[in-house]
Interface confidence: medium
């Protein structure tokens, strides 16, 4: 057992150009707090996997109000360390996520509003009992400087906090076969309680006679590295010689999850889904409060109103569960209409519409003439994935709202003059020409060349084009 400690030194603009705006303003004062999430090993766990090593939430920092016109300085920080207790052995390699949160203190309806300012993540090797390690991480235009260490809680000592120490029984030396407990030279290693032969580097025990393996090791004495290559066959070489994991009892056999947790197998081990109020690798930790940082995936923790619900996690879009530990299949809600295909990008849903439909949820029928009236007597024509209007004479445009100028195309031939008319255009022909468009010359004897002028119309009279 032991404690992982995180000390935040500064949070502010990074060194590059484009300094971020201050997260607080005179109108909206705010304060910062931090959340740390730890996971064992360097394994490529999904980001939404539980903080199996533990999590912690800092206190709120001092209230900060931006000075008008000033760039964002290093922001005031909460006092104290973030401490993440771990019950089992310290794994030596771990992954971390550190989130910087802003709490806005303006007149919020329903209390203060929280928003995530920055999130940094990394994977590190760290021996328990060592000195503070310093780190700098950047998230966008922000920079976070911090230090961390892992220390064992007595009576545990060693780089994995697996060796147990006891006060000396004699003032000058430890008992036979027992070494002093560095760095606690006034204490001695406790008598060996693990199974005989259990690897001191790769195994540990919590009960007399047992030998439990750190990640990456297997075998009864934790001396066999877990092979990354596949086994030849279930009846192939034994696991004792190759490190292959042969089929045996399932990791969920006997349900290792306490307090009503449900067990599901993972490629390497098992995972417990805990009821509200319990957490930890086996749901063994109870009495959870927001200070324990129980909400995953950026969920915001709010203290419950009664002891039976010590906290409530408000999950961000895309996550659910009492601890925001489950990814929601948002597409299962079938948000896309008219046969559209749903895509959950992560930051948003998108619908891929079938031809003829559009809109964020494919709700618009592009071929639908209903409700798309064409003005001035035009008629709506469907097709081609969009509607169009066939306009009455003298009108044009997408919806037949524009009055067309029938004379714009100079339709009257041979110098005829064009006049716009309510039903079209009229050509007043120059002498010697006739016809609707003044296209026919008039012969000297008065007879027109094809066709004959309609009765009652003399050559040269205006001809109306219908």
């Amino acid at each position: 057992a032991g404690v992982f400690e995180l000390q935040i030194h500064s949070f502010g603009p990074g060194p590059g150009p484009g300094a971020p705006r201050s997260p607080c303003s005179a109108r909206l004062p705010c304060r910062l707090f931090f959340r740390v999430c730890l996971k064992p090993g360097l394994s490529e766990e999904a980001a939404e996997s539980p903080c199996a090593l533990g999590a912690a939430l800092s206190a709120r920092g001092p209230v900060y109000t931006e000075q008008p016109g000033a760039p964002a300085p290093d922001l005031p920080l909460p006092d104290g360390l973030l401490q993440v207790p771990f019950r089992d052995a310290w794994p030596g390699t771990f992954s971390f996520i550190i989130e910087t949160w802003r709490e806005e203190l303006g007149d919020q309806i329903g209390g203060p509003a929280w928003s995530l300012l920055a999130r940094v993540a990394g994977r590190r090797r760290l021996a328990a009992g060592g000195p503070w390690a310093r780190d700098i991480q950047r998230a966008g235009a922000w920079e976070l400087r911090f230090s961390y260490r892992a220390r064992c809680e007595p009576p545990a000592v060693g780089t994995a906090c697996t060796r147990l120490c006891r006060p000396r029984s004699a003032p000058s030396r430890c008992g036979p076969g027992l070494r002093p407990c560095a760095p606690l030279e006034d204490e001695c290693e406790a008598p060996l309680v693990c199974r005989a032969g259990c690897s001191p580097e790769h195994g540990f025990c919590e009960q007399p006679g047992e030998c439990r393996c750190l990640e990456g090791w297997t075998g009864p004495l934790c001396t066999v590295p877990v092979s990354t290559s596949s086994c030849l066959s279930p009846r192939g070489p034994s696991s004792a010689t190759t490190g292959c994991l042969v089929p045996g009892p399932g990791p969920c056999d006997g349900n290792p999850c306490a307090n009503g947790g449900s067990c599901s197998e993972t490629p390497r081990s098992f995972e417990c889904t805990c009821p509200r109020g319990f957490y930890g690798l086996r749901c063994e930790v109870s009495g959870v409060t927001c200070a324990d940082g129980p909400c995953f995936n950026g969920g915001l923790c709010v203290g419950g109103a009664d002891p039976d619900s010590a906290y409530i996690c408000h999950c961000p879009p895309g996550f659910q569960g009492s601890n925001c530990e489950k990814r929601v299949d948002r597409c299962s809600l079938q948000p896309c209409r008219n046969g559209g295909l749903c895509l959950d990008l992560g930051h948003a849903l998108r619908c891929r519409c079938r031809a003829g439909f559009a809109g964020p949820r494919c709700e618009h029928d592009l071929d639908d003439c209903a409700g798309r009236a064409c003005a001035n007597g035009g008629t709506c024509v469907e097709g081609g994935g969009a509607h169009r209007c066939s306009c009455a004479l003298g009108f044009g445009g997408r919806d037949c709202r524009e009055r067309a100028d029938p004379c714009a195309a100079r339709p009257c031939a041979h110098g005829g003059r064009c006049y716009a008319h309510f039903s079209g255009l009229v050509c007043a022909c120059a002498p010697g020409y006739m016809g609707a468009r003044c296209e026919f010359p008039v012969h000297p004897d008065g007879a027109s060349a094809l066709p004959a002028a309609p009765p009652g119309l003399r050559p040269g009279d205006p001809q109306r084009y219908l």
Partner: antibody, heavy 122, light 112 residues
């Protein structure tokens, strides 16, 4: 921030995997995209992988590329490179409105990595 | 296929002048268009999203407009630092296309 790595000189047909490492945000919450740029040419979109891990490819890229990811990295595997695959490869995060009240989603790619150069030559 | 056609391929103007870059989509993309700036040897930089929304930190000299299939990027009060290649990109997912997020061919802006 995002940063690509893994670009190098390879012979035609030798598979190559490029890696995009992100910090400051979670790959479970954002879609990520690969874009390439041949020397002296324009940008060419290859594909995306969603927050949930589903890859989508340009039709020309299907079978030629494989996109996958872990919690902090995204990979692009060029399955059998040809000389036409010589380019600088960029990864970029996809941003956009969570809920759209109109058909304007405002999706875009930001930030971009500095790029990694892949040269395919015999 | 959804095709983005950018014109002209190159444009030249003096410091303090104005350039206009056009981008035509082969189908309606409902204002889901982004503009990027890329300088030689550098990564692309987002300028405009949603056809007309200025990305934070981008000078207001850059202006995006358009709708439907026709879009325009206008750079006014040209500065030497604006010399770059500019790309448009469709960001419209709701369509049956074989390239989801295609780019235009790019326009080189030369500042004299």
């Amino acid at each position: 921030s995002v940063e690509e790595s893994g670009g190098r000189l390879v012979t035609p047909g030798t598979p190559l995997t490029l890696t995009c490492t992100v910090s400051g945000f979670s790959l479970s919450r954002y879609a990520m995209s690969w874009v390439r740029q041949a020397p002296g040419k324009g940008l060419e979109w290859i594909g995306i992988i969603t927050g949930g891990g589903d890859p989508y490819y340009a039709s020309w890229a299907k079978g030629r590329f494989t996109i996958s990811k872990t919690s902090t990295t995204m990979d692009l595997k060029i399955t059998s490179p040809t000389t036409e695959d010589t380019a600088t490869y960029f990864c970029a995060r996809m941003i956009g409105s969570e809920y759209a009240s109109s058909s304007e989603y405002y999706d875009a790619f930001d930030p971009w990595g500095p790029g990694t150069l892949v040269t395919v030559s015999s | 296929a959804l095709v983005m056609t950018q014109t002209p391929s190159s444009v030249s103007a003096a410091v303090g002048g104005t350039v206009t870059i056009n981008c035509q989509a082969s189908q309606n993309i409902y204002s889901n268009l982004a503009w990027y700036q890329q300088k030689p040897g550098q990564r692309p930089k987002l300028l405009i999203y949603g056809a007309s929304n200025l990305e934070s930190g981008v000078p207001s000299r850059f202006k995006g407009s358009g709708s439907g299939t026709e879009y325009t990027l206008t750079i006014s009060d040209l500065e030497c630092d604006d010399a770059a290649i500019y790309y448009c990109q469709s960001a419209y997912y709701t369509t049956s296309v074989d390239v989801l997020y295609p780019f235009g061919g790019g326009t080189e802006v030369v500042v004299k």
